[in-house]
């Protein structure tokens, strides 16, 4: 028998290496039974998380699985760090792994790098 | 049942490249970390890197950078490392593993395959 | 890069025997979201490894209960409570929390 807990499926360690000035959008997979539980995202500062307020986000409904999404429109370099999503079920409140953005802007690269050169090259980084 | 199962090991010189496959069977591929290890004969283990299947992300060990490709095409649930300019001190069993990636609830290996870098 | 280092290197012990297998990092492998992945494996010889613990503590699916994992921080220990014949192999720990990751030297548990 399948669990009914609610689960969030953002791997741990995971990344994106986007493009300031590109438009993207944030997935935060959501696996629940009966009553879709609200969803918010947060942004890390240091060890807090900070609740993302007033951003544009949706849903996405798929056979399996809920998407909440957080979408960015356009990038910008302020959004490189760390992004973690919750959802309150039953009182309880259950966080995701956080997700980290890697935003290059393009003004400074000459040409688009690789998403392992994004990762492996934190100077291309805003922090 | 799940399975892991290496292929693409055997002799190969100095300075050449190889391709290794790892096919994986009995779990979603998208939802894990494939890892490659390699052991050295009669030594310890020591981590490659990985893949993430669902959209491509690595990491590697930094002695393998540049020298190490690891990929994965989800739809045939295969991964891959590339080894190029190989040497002696190469010569290992390379193991890969899949590691689920959200809660950490399983971690497969697969049984190895022997690469031996000889002239 | 974490170095984590195992001891004893070799474990001699009698079937029935309690075993207690060390390992230190060299730093703290707590992870930001509050957990510490430190993984401890099994390999016998000719064989592939298996995932034992994981998280410190928490025992893979079919691993029998007489091994359990503890510890935090960077001090680590496995402990196999009354030793089987199928125990005697080479146990690994390894860490997954701070890229590259690395693994122990290993602790051989030898049929004293």
């Known amino acids: 028998k399948e669990s009914c807990d609610v689960q969030l499926y953002i791997k741990r360690q995971s990344y994106h290496s986007i493009f300031a000035g590109d438009p993207f959008k944030l997935e935060c997979p959501v696996k629940y039974c009966a009553h879709r539980p609200q969803v918010t995202w947060c942004k890390l500062n240091g060890t807090t998380c900070v609740k993302l307020e007033g951003r544009h986000t949706s849903w996405k409904q798929e056979k399996n699985l809920s998407f909440f999404i957080l979408h960015f429109e356009p990038v910008l370099p302020s959004d490189n760090g760390s992004y973690r999503c919750s959802a309150n079920f039953l009182s309880a409140i259950i966080e995701s792994h956080s997700t980290t953005l890697y935003v290059t802007d393009v003004k400074s690269a000459s040409e688009r790098p690789s998403k392992d050169e994004m990762a492996s090259r934190p100077w291309l980084l805003y922090s | 049942e799940v399975q892991l199962v290496e292929s693409g090991g055997g002799l190969v010189q100095p300075g050449r490249s190889l391709r290794l496959s790892c096919t994986t069977s009995?779990?979603?591929?998208?939802?894990?970390?494939i890892h490659w290890f390699r052991q050295a004969p009669g030594k310890g283990l020591e981590w490659v890197g990985r893949n993430d299947p669902a959209n491509g992300n690595t990491k590697y060990t930094a002695s393998f950078k540049g020298r190490a490709t690891i990929s994965a095409d989800g739809s045939k649930s295969i991964a891959y490392l590339q080894m190029n300019s190989l040497k002696t001190e190469d010569t290992a069993v390379y193991y890969c593993?899949?590691?689920?990636?959200?809660?950490?609830?399983?971690?497969?290996w697969g049984q190895g395959t022997l690469v031996t870098v000889s002239s | 890069e974490i170095v984590l280092t195992q001891s004893p290197g070799t474990l001699s012990l009698s079937p029935g025997e309690r075993a207690t297998l060390s390992c230190r990092s060299s730093q703290s492998l707590l992870d930001r979201d509050g957990k510490t992945y430190l993984n401890w494996l099994q390999q016998k010889p000719g064989q592939a490894p298996r995932r034992l613990i994981y998280?410190?503590?928490k025992l893979d699916s079919g691993i029998p209960d007489r091994f359990s994992g503890s510890g935090s921080g960077t001090d680590f220990t496995l402990t196999i409570s009354r030793l089987e014949p199928e125990d005697f192999a080479v146990y690994y720990c390894w860490q997954d929390t701070h890229f590259p990751y690395t693994f122990g030297q290993g602790t051989k548990l030898e049929i004293k």
């Open positions: 593993a899949s590691y689920e990636g959200y809660y950490e609830r399983f971690g497969y």
């Open positions: 998280l410190v503590s």
């Open positions: 009995g779990f979603n591929i998208k939802d894990t970390y």
